[in-house]
C-alpha cells in the first residue's frame, strides 16, 4: 500500500526516501519512477543513481539531500495537477528480491487563493498576469512574473497607483521587484 504526501500547485513536492549505506561510499543504485513499484526496476523512470552519481534525471526532478549519505528523497519542482499519482522509490540492494520498495502517493491540491486588500485586488484585476509566486519551503521567495503587453501610459498610471499603495509596501517588504 502507498503512503500519501501532499503539495499545492506551484509548490515543490517532497517525497522522502532513505537508506543506510553499508559503509561510506558503498552506495547502491536507486531509481525513482512514476507509477507503483513493479516486480523489478522502476517504470517511467524520472531519476536514477548508480554506485557513484545521479546518472539520469528529467527536468523538475532532483535530489535535495546528499544521496551519498543515503538521502534519496525526491523533490518535484513547481508541481501541477498532472504530477498527482503514485511514485516508486526503489533501493536496489544486491541479491535476489532484496530491493526495498516504497510506493508514495502524491496528491496535488489547487493553490490556495487568499483574499487581498481592495487596492491590490483592483490592481491584479487590471493586470491579471503580473503577480505570481514561485518556490516552496523554507527558502520560499515571492517574485513578479512578466508584465503583460501594456503601453507606456498604462505603465505610468500603474506606477502612480503603486506609489503609496499597500501593495507597494508589500512588494518592498518581500524584496520583490518590478521587471
Amino acid at each position: 500500500s502507498e503512503v500519501e504526501y501532499r503539495a499545492e500547485v506551484g509548490q515543490n513536492a517532497y517525497l522522502p526516501c532513505f537508506y543506510t549505506p553499508a559503509a561510506p561510499g558503498n552506495l547502491v543504485p536507486v531509481c525513482w519512477g512514476k507509477g507503483a513499484c513493479p516486480v523489478f526496476e522502476c517504470g517511467n523512470v524520472v531519476l536514477r543513481t548508480d554506485e557513484r552519481d545521479v546518472n539520469y534525471w528529467t527536468s523538475r526532478y532532483w535530489l535535495n539531500g546528499d544521496f551519498r549519505k543515503g538521502d534519496v528523497s525526491l523533490t518535484i519542482e513547481n508541481v501541477t495537477l498532472a504530477d498527482s499519482g503514485i511514485y516508486c522509490c526503489r533501493i536496489q540492494i544486491p541479491g535476489i528480491m532484496n530491493d526495498e520498495k516504497f510506493n508514495l502517493k502524491l496528491v496535488i491540491k489547487p493553490a490556495k487563493v487568499t483574499p487581498a486588500p481592495t487596492r491590490q485586488r483592483d490592481f491584479t484585476a487590471a493586470f491579471p498576469r503580473m503577480l505570481t509566486t514561485r518556490g516552496h519551503g523554507p527558502a520560499e521567495t515571492q517574485t513578479l512574473g512578466s508584465l503583460p503587453d501594456i503601453n507606456l501610459t498604462q505603465i505610468s498610471t500603474l506606477a502612480n497607483e503603486l506609489r503609496d499603495s499597500r501593495l507597494a509596501n508589500d512588494l518592498r517588504d518581500s524584496g520583490a521587484t518590478i521587471r
Partner: antibody, heavy 117, light 107 residues
C-alpha cells in the same frame, strides 16, 4: 571503533557566547551528517540542527535559528556548536550525534553548559 | 513542525512483563521513525530505526512496529537493565522532532 568525544563542561555568564566541540574517531565526518541535540534537566531531547561536513550545508530547528551556529572542520574531523546571547534557558547538556542518514546511531558523551552570573 | 506525541509519560511494570509504548506523529512520516533508550545519567542509545529494524547489539526482546502516524515500541520479558527513559524521533522532515519520553520504572 566509532567515538564522538565532546569538549568539557562550561560555566559562562549571561550574554556571552560559547563554542562546543565534538571530535570524531573511527570514521570520517564527511561521510555522515553531524547533529546537535539539547537536553535540559528533566526535559526531553530537542534537535538543534545538523551540518553536512562535506559541503558545509546546515539545517536548524526554527527555535535555534540565530541562537546556534553549527560548523565543521574536516581536517580535524570535528563538528562545532556555537551558542550566542546566552541565558539561563541555555543551561543544558548538549550532545553531538551522527546520522545514518535520518537516525542517530552514535552519540557523544555530552557537554554540560551552565549559564550563571 | 511534526509533533511526536508519546504515551504514557511514565510507566511502572514488573520484571518479566511485556510493555508497550506508543508514539503518534501529527502527520504522515511513513516508516522514518527511530526509538532511543536513555538510562539515568547516561547518553541516549539507538534501539530501533525505520520503525521496526533492530540496531546492532540491541536484545531481541525490543521490537518496533507501525507506519504513517502510529508507532509502538514493545519490550517483552522486562529486565532490570531496561529501567530508562525511551524516546521516539521522526527523521523525515526538518526540524527533526522527538517524543516527550516515557520513563519506565520497575515495580
Amino acid at each position: 571503533e566509532v567515538q564522538l568525544q565532546q569538549s568539557g563542561a562550561e560555566l559562562v555568564k549571561p550574554g556571552a557566547s560559547v563554542k562546543l566541540s565534538c571530535t570524531a574517531s573511527g570514521f570520517n565526518i564527511k561521510d555522515y551528517y553531524m547533529h546537535w541535540v539539547k537536553q535540559r534537566t528533566d526535559h526531553g531531547l530537542e534537535w538543534i540542527g545538523r551540518i553536512d561536513p562535506d559541503n558545509g550545508e546546515t539545517k536548524y530547528a526554527p527555535k535555534f535559528q540565530g541562537k546556534a551556529t553549527i560548523t565543521a572542520d574536516t581536517s580535524s574531523n570535528t563538528a562545532y556548536l556555537q551558542l550566542g546571547s546566552l541565558t539561563s534557558e541555555d543551561t543544558a547538556v548538549y550532545y553531538c550525534a551522527r546520522s545514518s542518514p535520518y537516525y542517530f546511531d552514535y552519540w557523544g558523551q555530552g557537554t554540560t553548559l551552565t549559564v550563571s552570573s | 513542525d511534526i509533533q511526536m506525541n508519546q504515551s504514557p509519560s511514565s510507566l511502572s511494570a514488573s520484571l518479566g512483563d511485556t510493555i508497550t509504548i506508543t508514539c503518534h506523529a501529527s502527520q504522515n512520516i511513513n516508516v522514518w521513525l527511530s526509538w532511543y533508550q536513555q538510562k539515568p545519567g547516561n547518553i541516549p542509545k539507538l534501539l530501533i530505526y525505520k520503525a521496526s529494524n533492530l540496531h546492532t547489539g540491541v536484545p531481541s526482546r525490543f521490537s518496533g512496529s507501525g507506519s504513517v502516524t502510529g508507532f509502538t515500541l514493545t519490550i517483552s520479558s522486562l529486565q532490570p537493565e531496561d529501567i530508562a527513559t525511551y524516546y521516539c524521533q521522526q527523521g523525515q522532515n526538518f526540524p527533526y522532532t522527538f517524543g516527550g519520553g516515557t520513563k519506565l520504572e520497575i515495580k
